[in-house]
Amino acid sequence: ELCDDDPPEIPHATFKAMAYKEGTMLNCECKRGFRRIKSGSLYMLCTGNSSHSSWDNQCQCTSSATRNTTKQVTPQPEEQKERKTTEMQSPMQPVDQASLPGHCREPPPWENEATERIYHFVVGQMVYYQCVQGYRALHRGPAESVCKMTHGKTRWTQPQLICTGEMETSQFPGEEKPQASPEGRPESETSCLVTTTDFQIQTEMAATMETSIFTTEYQ
């Protein structure tokens, strides 16, 4: 079941998913000056069976101005499989959803794809939030949201995250004072300032996850 709405908007924050539940759709969006090829797919769809999930359809973009042929990105299915490297995953990463059954990994890029992807999520999808550059996180709970079905309607849980500019000093009761940091402003194409919080994604341990997110995981 598709979620009726997009995940909640948190001021000065972005959200991302680690993996995508079966049924998720990804729009085939092209960058400015390009369009989907005629008879091309409108979207990619995460499908699968009990043992394997993958994306159906391929997105292809062509120049809006000319009728030249598209350069199609070669699929790399081997990269949907688990990789083993010597690099350690940060212990603060969220639970590795992509290793769970019924989830697709990130679809590969395609030529002249729009920078920002538009997903249509399904019930059970989890997304994680982080403050944008120049803002720091004040956490009151997990910085995540899950699409749930209640009384026949879908809703996203509210992520417990507030992103504050470096100059602001407002705090929640009982919240530790964030460490001092240089003043900041939102990210722009010309300037970026230090984000003062490390990669913090807090997950309720009582959730359906069976393993602790704080165990170090090798890729």
């Epitope: 990463q93 990994r105 794809e113 920002e116 550059q133 230090v194 984000t195």
Partner: nanobody, 125 residues
């Protein structure tokens, strides 16, 4: 201030290996996709490899697939490019790039908002 500093380049023989590193600072490295691009003398900068924010999904240019491996260590704010079976046509300046806040991959130059100064890789025959 966002900084990307590449290292590990050098002069090697065809068939040799090199490992490039990119030390990142001034932004939340664990939240961003990253990529490697290269520019050969007299040519345009081209995509080499990219990796998602989690470090779990990767994508490569056809010319390097199977020979190069991109990885990122979110705990150490470092991006890597392991290059093996190097060929003379791999010669060029290799750049590390940070994906924009909302970009899933650092696949095209449009996806990226910050670049390192580059490190020279020269492969002799």
């Amino acid at each position: 201030q966002v900084q990307l500093v590449e290292s590990g380049g050098g002069l090697v023989q065809a068939g040799d290996s090199l490992r490039l590193s990119c030390a990142a600072s001034g932004f939340n490295f664990g939240w961003h996709a990253m990529g490697w691009f290269r520019q050969a003398p007299g040519k345009e900068r081209e995509f080499v490899a990219t990796i998602t924010w989690t470090g779990r999904d990767t994508y490569y240019a056809d010319s390097v697939r199977g020979r190069f491996t991109i990885s990122k260590d979110n705990a150490k704010n470092t991006l890597f490019l392991q290059m093996s079976s190097l060929r003379p046509d791999d010669t060029g300046v290799y750049y590390c790039a940070k994906a924009r806040e909302r970009a899933t991959w650092a696949y095209s130059e449009d996806d990226c908002d910050y670049w390192g100064q580059g490190t020279q890789v020269t492969v002799s025959s």
